[in-house]
């Protein structure tokens, strides 16, 4: 007698491993036999795919090679034509063991910068990732951490983070280790140990000793009044990641020396600088007491930015004073050309003031510095970039001659407004019409209800207050 | 000798106003800069509003701004903070403050000399 | 806007001891950053400008330093007198943060 078609082994859940064989038995008893079909997520798997293999009149479903993409649920349907078609399904899981799909590769990092070394896994169930360092597995902190994606992320980086570093992936059906990688961690050039200042007689042997470190190991250049040093012999060792380097000295004349470490990022350098004085003990003889006199400001460049008849010390230590003033403001003046208009007024004024020094009359005249944190302002808020251009200009020697090196003052080294008011000179140019600033950036996100120009933010990559550019 | 006075704090109502001043001597108020600085009872300092009077540039933290206003008047050597539609949290004792030299600089200078600070109190 | 994160954010010292506050930029900022120095009840004092001048008439003990966002406030021997709340405070051009205080008890 005709009999319906009823499934007697419904089918049930599959967990395979990837590329092993996974079956589904569908049983049915009916009369007359019954066309079995299968589907995949509700789409018929043809009878021709070669990926499967269908036996026993439609009952046995077989994937002859799991992918981890069969995951999914599998029916089959029975219809003899009598009474209705009926169905049962079943899901496959597709086991895997661990594998590392992104492994970690090698990373130079900047100390005190951020790093991630990528881990990213599949794998059912979900492995869990770990990391080892050296023979040991690492341990968490407020530093390092393994992200959700199995990746390695470590704030701050220090020098004792560089070092050898794997991933470990691991479920409950294996293990999977990534090839090791290296982290190596790159510190911006710094001084140890500056050179110090010395007061000496005419005609003695000085030694100016210098010791920096960084990684890669700094080289140390030396300055003398702003030149590169002509005479005078060096001598340099290395030893544990710090170059030491001693400039040994003739005296004839007071001089300021200055102690350059360099070391190079990828395409950008780092600096710090140190700065000494020689000065010899019988300079001040009478006779050459006046370093330089008042006189009244006859030049051109500076005209707009200097006081009306303005009284400037003019350095006697020049042929011409007039002249090779007037020539210093010129060269760096033209530097200013490219400058943002933002920089560029404050500049000429720090220029300015610099070149040409107020100059209190006197028996002897003396030069009025510019107040250190006029001096600050203009480099950190309205000349940021343009400074650390110029810096990185010196570094690279582009700069056609030295002359401009003695244009920019060292902020450092000027007196504070704090200490007495009336012994340095301030900047009166440093507030602006809005008119003239088409281009004023804007501030941070929380405007205030003044036009400021933008304080260096994290977001620019060409500047970093940090000893990379010591603006001191 | 440089001196800062504070005065006009008390109890007020939530929404209501107050008008802090602040009076200097021993310096002008045309020269420097003034700042107001709060602190909560057992918290930390909080910087409120600053003015330069000599460019009459005004700025103001975001959890005051369009309720407070920092102003100065130059004859009378004295700066003001006028405080409108109050909250509980503006609770603290305010004190003003004082830096060398125009707003680009006065970052630099710190503030070197502080009032004794006045007490608000916001509470229904 | 630029936070300043302060740590640690109270120490007990001896005196003697040498301390170390530091402060922490969330992002590049000028050298224009100060420390101060507040006892209970009473106004702040300026240590520090400039992120590391000695205002006039602080003792030399303490000193100020920057190694990139990180700003330094040490005392480099403890006295009585140093038993105070210490702040670091950043000035943008006007919008200035204050970092959350370190407390400096006896040990």
């Known amino acids: 007698l005709p009999k319906a078609p009823v499934i007697t082994t419904p089918l049930e859940t599959v967990d395979a491993l990837v590329e092993e064989v996974a079956t589904f038995m569908c049983a049915v008893e009916s009369y007359p036999q019954p066309e079995i079909s299968w589907t995949r997520n509700k789409i018929l798997i043809k009878l021709f795919d070669t990926r499967y293999s269908i036996r026993e009149n439609g009952q046995l479903l077989t994937i002859l090679s799991v992918e981890d993409s069969d995951d999914g649920i599998y029916c089959c349907t029975a219809n003899n034509g009598v009474g209705g078609a009926v169905e049962s399904c079943g899901a496959l899981q597709v086991k895997m063991k661990p594998k590392i799909t992104r492994p970690p590769i090698n990373v130079k990092i900047i100390e005190g910068l951020k790093a991630v070394l990528p881990c990213t896994t599949m794998g059912n169930p979900k492995p869990s990732v770990s990391w080892i360092k050296g023979d040991s597995p690492l341990r968490e902190n407020s530093r390092i951490a393994v992200l959700e994606s199995g990746s390695l992320r470590i704030h701050n980086v220090q020098k004792e983070d560089a070092g050898q570093y794997r991933c470990v992936a691991k479920n409950s059906l294996g293990t999977a280790y990534s090839k090791v990688v290296k982290l190596e961690v790159e510190v911006f050039a710094r001084i140890l140990r500056a050179p110090e200042s010395h007061n000496v007689t005419f005609g003695s042997f000085v030694t100016l000793h210098c010791t920096a470190t960084g990684i890669p190991v700094p080289t140390i250049t030396w300055i003398e009044n702003g030149n590169a040093v002509s005479s005078g012999s060096i001598q340099e060792s290395v030893k544990d990641r710090v170059i030491d380097s001693r400039l040994q000295l003739f005296i004839t004349k007071p001089g300021l020396y200055t102690c350059i470490a360099t070391n190079k990022h990828g395409e950008k350098f780092s600096t710090a600088k140190a700065a000494a004085t020689i000065s010899i003990a019988e300079w001040s003889k009478p006779q050459k007491d006046n370093k330089g006199y008042c006189a009244q400001y006859r030049g051109e460049v500076c005209n707009a930015v200097l006081a009306k008849d303005a009284l400037v010390f003019l350095n006697t230590s020049y042929a011409d004073p007039e002249e090779a003033q007037e020539l210093l403001v010129h060269t760096a003046w033209n530097e200013l050309k490219v400058v943002s208009p933002v920089c560029r007024p404050a500049a000429e004024a720090l220029l300015c003031n610099h070149i040409f020094q107020e100059c209190s009359p006197g028996v002897v005249p003396t030069p009025i510095p510019i107040c250190r944190e006029y001096c600050l302002a203009v480099k950190e808020l309205f000349c940021a970039k343009e400074w650390l251009v110029m810096e990185e200009k010196t570094h690279r020697g582009l700069y056609r001659s030295e002359m401009h090196l003695l244009s920019v003052p060292e902020c450092s080294k000027l007196p504070s407004m704090h200490w007495d008011p009336t012994a340095c000179a301030r900047l009166p140019h440093l507030d602006y019409n809005k008119e003239n600033l088409k281009t004023f950036p804007p501030m941070t996100s929380s405007k205030p209800s003044v036009d400021i120009p933008n304080l260096p933010s994290s977001s620019s990559s060409s500047f970093s207050v940090s000893p990379t550019y010591s603006m001191t | 000798e440089v001196q800062l006075v504070e005065s006009g704090g008390g109890l007020v109502q939530p929404g209501g106003s107050l008008r802090l001043s602040c009076a200097a001597s021993?310096?002008?108020?045309?020269?420097?800069?003034i700042h107001w600085v709060r602190q909560a009872p057992g918290k930390g300092l909080e910087w409120v509003a600053s003015?330069?009077?000599?460019?009459?540039?005004?700025s103001y933290a975001d959890s005051v701004k369009g309720r407070f206003t920092i102003s100065a008047d130059t004859s009378k050597n004295t700066a003001y903070l006028q405080m409108n539609s109050l909250r509980a949290e503006d609770t603290a004792v305010y004190y003003c403050?004082?830096?060398?030299?125009?707003?680009?600089?006065?970052?630099?200078?710190?503030?070197?000399?502080w009032g004794q600070g006045t007490l608000v109190t916001v509470s229904s | 806007d630029i936070q300043m994160t302060q740590s640690p954010s109270s120490l007990s010292a001896s005196v003697g001891d040498r301390v170390t506050i530091t402060c922490r930029a969330s992002?590049?900022?000028?050298?224009?950053v100060a420390w101060y120095q507040q006892k209970p009840g009473k106004a702040p004092k300026l240590l520090i400008y400039?992120?590391?001048s000695l205002y006039s008439g602080v003792p030399s003990r303490f000193s100020g330093s920057r190694s990139g966002t990180d700003f330094t406030l040490t005392i480099s021997s403890l006295q009585p007198e140093d038993f105070a709340t210490y702040y670091c405070?950043?000035?943008?051009?006007?919008?200035?943060?204050f970092g959350q205080g370190t407390k400096v008890e006896i040990k």
């Open positions: 021993g310096f002008t108020v045309s020269s420097s800069s």
């Open positions: 403050a004082r830096s060398e030299g125009d707003r680009y600089v006065s970052g630099y200078m710190g503030f070197d000399y």
């Open positions: 405070q950043q000035s943008g051009v006007w919008l200035i943060t």
């Open positions: 003015i330069s009077s000599s460019y009459g540039s005004t």
């Open positions: 992002q590049s900022v000028s050298s224009a």
């Open positions: 400039s992120a590391s």
